[in-house]
């Protein structure tokens, strides 16, 4: 019961840490950036992944897709690649996990595979939630960057003067959200990795095998039963050997020499 | 890089009107403000308007009710109205756009400036 439980919260954390991963790729609000101040009027913009939009006091908004730029910063296409490997991870783990949930029966589908399928989809998000997590890091280490840089410089350019402006950068909500939703989807990822050990557990129950010699010259065959890990083929403890071999279960009989345990 | 080019400065009689326009050109990412500015012979340079890509309007005091400035986003091209046109608003006016950077700050373009001159 602890297992299906730990395995069902682990798939709706990471549902939901993935969810957010996806919104926070699309979300424009990255970064938010003053632009320009006045008694009257104040602009500012806020920039996303793909696109950059200007918002006014007065509620004008205007978005417009980088497509339009030359030269966008290599950290920027590095972010959206981390985001969307997070997202296809995180997808595909969403799938398998689907398949891999105690409570959903499938065909004559065992534990074994389906504690397969929950350790392949924990890692999944384990690593979808990583992705998202540098990916959000990675950005905001370059707003940072970026503002440090380029403090206020003054040159003359063609058909005039050049200024920089230093203007205030804040994180953007798609940051935290995205922060958010990475720890999410990488906690999902580690309760599906411990659900999947309770779905197979290590089952070391020997049982305990006389055997009788049909004769005096028959000698014991050893190594009569494997241990079964949940894994192998011999997970229901059947016989090896059948020559004068019963289980404890089949035939009581008194200690000798020739007993194995 | 942006080019600023200005241009409708000249002589003027008091009480006259000029037109200025200043169009950008070149590979940039957005205009998100427009604004002229004005030196007059030995003195700062001060604020007489500024227009933002939605079209808010800020006028200096010592123009304010006898200008209009006005832009077209799709041009990158501002215009600055002056109308009762006075003595002491002889000047150079220089044309000023702030152009986003995404990811970076903005920068701010200045242009040669084209003279103004009120005089009878």
């Known amino acids: 019961m602890a297992v299906t439980a730990c395995q069902g919260l682990g798939f709706v954390v990471s549902l939901i840490g993935i969810a957010g991963i996806i919104a926070a790729t699309c979300m424009d609000q990255w970064s938010t950036q003053d632009l320009y101040n006045n008694p009257v009027t104040a602009v500012f913009n806020y920039q996303g992944l793909w696109r950059s939009c200007v918002r006014e006091s007065s509620g004008f908004t205007e978005c417009r897709g980088y497509f339009t730029l030359l030269g966008l910063p290599a950290m920027l296409q590095a972010v959206r690649a981390l985001m969307i490997v997070g997202i296809v991870l995180g997808a595909i783990g969403l799938l398998v996990s689907i398949f891999a949930l105690k409570c959903i029966r499938i065909g004559s589908m065992e534990d074994s595979a389906k504690a397969n399928m929950t350790l392949t989809s924990g890692i999944m998000f384990i690593v979808s939630g990583l992705c998202a997590i540098a990916g959000v890091s990675v950005f905001a280490n370059m707003l940072v960057t970026n503002f440090w840089m380029s403090t206020a410089n003054m040159y003359t350019g063609m058909g005039g003067m050049v200024q920089t402006v230093q203007t205030r950068y804040t994180f953007g909500a798609a940051l935290f959200v995205g922060w958010v939703a990475g720890g999410l989807t990488l906690i999902g990822g580690v309760m599906m990795c411990i659900a999947c050990r309770g779905l197979a557990p290590e089952e070391t129950n020997y049982k305990a095998v006389s055997y009788h010699a049909s004769g005096h010259s028959v000698a014991y065959k050893p190594g009569g039963f494997k241990a079964s890990t949940g894994f192998g083929s011999n997970t229901k403890n059947k016989k090896i050997y059948d020559g004068g071999a019963r289980t404890e279960d089949e035939v009581q009989s008194y200690p000798s020499k020739h007993d194995y345990v | 890089e942006v080019q600023l080019v200005e241009s409708g400065g000249g002589l003027v009689q008091p009480g006259g009107s000029l037109r200025l326009s200043c169009a950008a050109s070149?590979?940039?990412?957005?205009?998100?403000?427009y604004g002229w500015y004005r030196q007059a012979p030995g003195k700062g340079r001060e604020l007489v308007a500024t227009?933002?890509?939605?079209?808010?309007?800020y006028y200096a005091d010592s123009m304010k009710g006898r200008s209009t400035i006005s832009r077209d986003n799709a041009k990158n091209t501002v215009y600055l109205q002056m109308n009762s046109l006075k003595p002491e608003d002889t000047a150079v006016y220089y044309c000023?756009?702030?152009?986003?950077?995404?990811?970076?700050?903005?920068?701010?373009?200045w242009g040669q400036g084209t003279l103004v001159t009120v005089s009878s």
């Open positions: 227009i933002t890509r939605g079209g808010s309007t």
């Open positions: 000023n756009v702030r152009v986003e950077v995404p990811f970076m700050q903005p920068n701010d373009y």
């Open positions: 070149g590979s940039f990412f957005r205009i998100v403000m």
